[in-house]
Amino acid sequence: IWELKKDVYVVELDWYPDAPGEMVVLTCDTPEEDGITWTLDQSSEVLGSGKTLTIQVKEFGDAGQYTCHKGGEVLSHSLLLLHKKEDGIWSTDILKDQKEPKNKTFLRCEAKNYSGRFTCWWLTTISTDLTFSVKSSRGSSDPQGVTCGAATLSAERVRGDNKEYEYSVECQEDSACPAAEESLPIEVMVDAVHKLKYENYTSSFFIRDIIKPDPPKNLQLKPLKNSRQVEVSWEYPDTWSTPHSYFSLTFCVQVQGKSKREKKDRVFTDKTSATVICRKNASISVRAQDRYYSSSWSEWASVPCS
Amino acid sequence: RAVPGGSSPAWTQCQQLSQKLCTLAWSAHPLVGHMDLREEGDEETTNDVPHIQCGDGCDPQGLRDNSQFCLQRIHQGLIFYEKLLGSDIFTGEPSLLPDSPVGQLHASLLGLSQLLQPEGHHWETQQIPSLSPSQPWQRLLLRFKILRSLQAFVAVAARVFAHGAATLSP
């Protein structure tokens, strides 16, 4: 048993059929010695008397808010949550496996630049009785500070019969060094509590591996005289790290016809302009990637040829 | 060339070669099914590689103030990786394919280190750890880890030279 926060405790339960459970001793936080009784949740059934209460935690029915009283007055509370191991594996029931980039990916994180700021998000089908708390650090043995905000509901989607809820959190490394080569990964830890179930999820990454620039901005076309060619120009996104002579991007320019089946013409360039042939009803799209490290491409920025 | 006394390197040549190094490092080890090498344990194997750290002066301001600290650090790293790529980790079993970019990568690391330091001038180099994995599968894993680490190192080096070529070239 360990303390999650004041008066909230997590019992680690290795469950299997006929498992004996965990013996837990609760102590009433009071100087009083006599006349103390214990109840669970809203029930008035007295579970025991005395300053301490010993319980055998075998299942969720044994978890909840234990209260000690004296003469009708509440003395203290202890909320017991269960962290369950089933078949030797800690439960991961609260969050949905996003399966990208690999199985058992519950948390996904992205950074728009090298400033040490990043966003993580996760999915659940649970709509009520749900709380999250997020902690992060650079490295684990001698951790350096990363400050995370509160997790917030950022999107709701309908998936078949189910509603899916997306939560996200923003974190910022306290002493970020954008130009350095990372040697210790960022660790992100999410505590999730649904009803009386506690679960924790972790992700470990280098900022360089989660970089995804915003799309190029100010995408413009300039027709070239007496030609079907156009000069496409764009700018670095505002959110990208500066100076651009140091934090450089590379770009992919694509000409795509109306039909998805039509052949796509692609040009790769380090410049912020390119000359392409504009076909009727086609569109021109540009996306960006770190020039020197193959992290994710940005989403496309697009303009119609006409 | 970074000649004794701290004159400037051939920024543009260094830029071109470092960008080529980035391309080669990624073609030598693309993201194989997002294999997370940090989950594979034995951290000590790649913990000893020289990293370009915050105080090494490789940021734009540090380069403007005195690029020599940073160039020395990059040189150290290039020599370190050049030795690793020439060691039995890469020469032993399982043999690399004849068209593997590792050979080109090895030559380019040497080329860039020579651009930074001419014969007769010696910056101190970091001791290469004695990593001699016995099993071919351990060797393979170590190759992946070294190449992943090299990708991060050459990315920073390439940024340094690109910025130097754009802002510090005479």
């Epitope: 469950w15 299997y16 059929p17 075998k58 299942e59 969720f60 029915g61 369950k84 089933e86 078949d87 029931d93 089908t125 649970i126 078949g160 019969d161 189910n162 649904h194 009803k195 009386l196 179930k197 | -």
Partner: nanobody, 123 residues
Framework: EVQLVESGGGLVQAGGSLRLSCAAS????????MGWFRQAPGKEREFVAQ????????YYADAVKGRFTISRDNAKNTVSLQMNSLKPEDTAVYYC????????????????WGQGTQVTVSS
Amino acid sequence: EVQLVESGGGLVQAGGSLRLSCAASGRTFSGYDMGWFRQAPGKEREFVAQISRHNSNTYYADAVKGRFTISRDNAKNTVSLQMNSLKPEDTAVYYCAIGSLFPSSRERDYDYWGQGTQVTVSS
């Protein structure tokens, strides 16, 4: 919204068998733990059995252990309770319930309930 419909109840002699079924609709059934409860006349509703969402681990009340078997078919969105060696004290209305806490014998840990099916065991 989730709907649960029980079937398979009836009158049976002591020592006999019955198989109860519960069909779920309205949400992805595989994401829930499933349970059966029962309520005998004049008594409180009590836990019978539960099956987990993932690996079909099972949890039983002591009174039915060895006689009842709970199973589920995620493809068909059903959960079944095979009741053997029935006793007169097994007479009750049997309710199917789903929740998200396994193992739990506590009523309030279940989110959705069926209307119930009557099982009568005569001596």
